[in-house]
Interface confidence: medium
Amino acid sequence: YFGKLESKLSVIRNLNDQVLFIDQGNRPLFEDMTDSDCRDNAPRTIFIISMYKDSQPRGMAVTISVKCEKISTLSCENKIISFKEMNPPDNIKDTKSDIIFFQRSVPGHDNKMQFESSSYEGYFLACEKERDLFKLILKKEDELGDRSIMFTVQNED
């Protein structure tokens, strides 16, 4: 069971300081941006991180949404990352959900975050280069100290 607490507005960056944004095709991508670029591209660079109470002690449960014309929420259904047109629900009556991630702080690095899927234990949000694009994907953690699954989260409100 997950019960919604409150939400905050955040900018999410990978460890190469590229900014996460949602493009015109609703794809989550990373791109080099100056602070003014980041502001100019809002609301596509501003993510709504909603925190949830978890009935099991597993960590800080969150959803990640973005509001352009409508609110879309990040999903990892079938281990494929996409934004689905939906509001983060007030309650989820299950112990796992494709839209719930556990936001974890890397031991020894309080400012570095990981987002582990509640549906797929051991799978994390990651940045992966595909041709010329830096995409947000779901990835099984397979190597120690994998920087691709680490992010910084900067609160905007």
Partner: antibody, heavy 119, light 110 residues
């Protein structure tokens, strides 16, 4: 770097209660779990329960259910552990431990508080 | 009460490699991650390994963890006198809905 500072040593009579505090400084407090772990003299570690201050409710190990109460005050970044109906076998060092990665990965520990239960 | 089994003591000479075992069951290690803590004499425990084999920053790469089935082990290479301490394994236990520690292993550097 987060620091957890615990209250001082206590001597208590059997049947009484003790309340130990744990103040966090230098880092995020509210969204991470604070656990309480005890260690009897010359013995191993024993988890008692935890709280995620932001959630406001605690989880307790079965063994301590009904006898331990874990609370947190977000405004002062302080967690508390109260143990009631004390007996001599509760004599131990009580540690608070922060868990930022996972509620059960204790990456930061307080210095410990010795609680002695003696008549 | 102790659900995870560790040898009470191990020893090794400086520069040697030692391993500490931790044996559990399908309700804990078999289906969950293992963490290791080091407790130097008179001090609070310190996280050494988390999620089976991850080292927090600041922990030397002489320390490594592994897991297979319902057992886990901690390996320390290039043993140093400052490694003399108690070592505890820890895992989540679904049957007791609790986290469990091993009984601890005292490492002596000869």
């Amino acid at each position: 770097e987060v620091q957890l500072v615990q209250s001082g040593a206590e001597v208590k009579k059997p049947g009484s209660s003790v309340k130990v505090s744990c103040k966090a400084s230098g880092g995020t407090f509210n969204s991470y779990a604070i656990s309480w772990v005890r260690q009897a003299p010359g013995q191993g570690l024993e988890w008692m329960g935890n709280i995620i201050p932001h959630y406001g409710f605690a989880y307790y190990a079965q063994k301590f259910q009904g006898r331990v109460t874990i609370t947190a005050d977000e405004s002062t970044s302080t967690a508390y552990m109260e143990l009631s109906s004390l007996r001599s076998e509760d004599t131990a060092v009580y540690y608070c431990a922060r868990a930022a990665y996972h509620p059960l990965v204790f990456d930061n520990w307080g210095q410990g508080t010795l609680v002695t239960v003696s008549s | 009460d102790i659900v995870l089994t560790q040898p009470p003591s191990v020893s090794g000479a400086p520069g040697q490699r030692v391993t500490i075992s931790c044996s559990g069951s399908s309700s804990n290690i078999g289906n969950h991650y293992v963490n290791w803590y080091q407790q130097l004499p008179g001090t609070a425990p310190k996280l050494l390994i988390y999620r089976n084999n991850h080292r927090p920053s600041g922990v030397p790469d002489r320390f490594s963890g592994s897991k297979s089935g319902t057992s886990a082990s901690l390996a320390i290479t290039g043993l140093q006198s400052e490694d003399e301490a108690d070592y505890y394994c820890q895992s989540w236990d679904y049957s007791g809905f609790s986290t469990v520690f091993g009984g601890g292993t005292k490492l002596t550097v000869l």
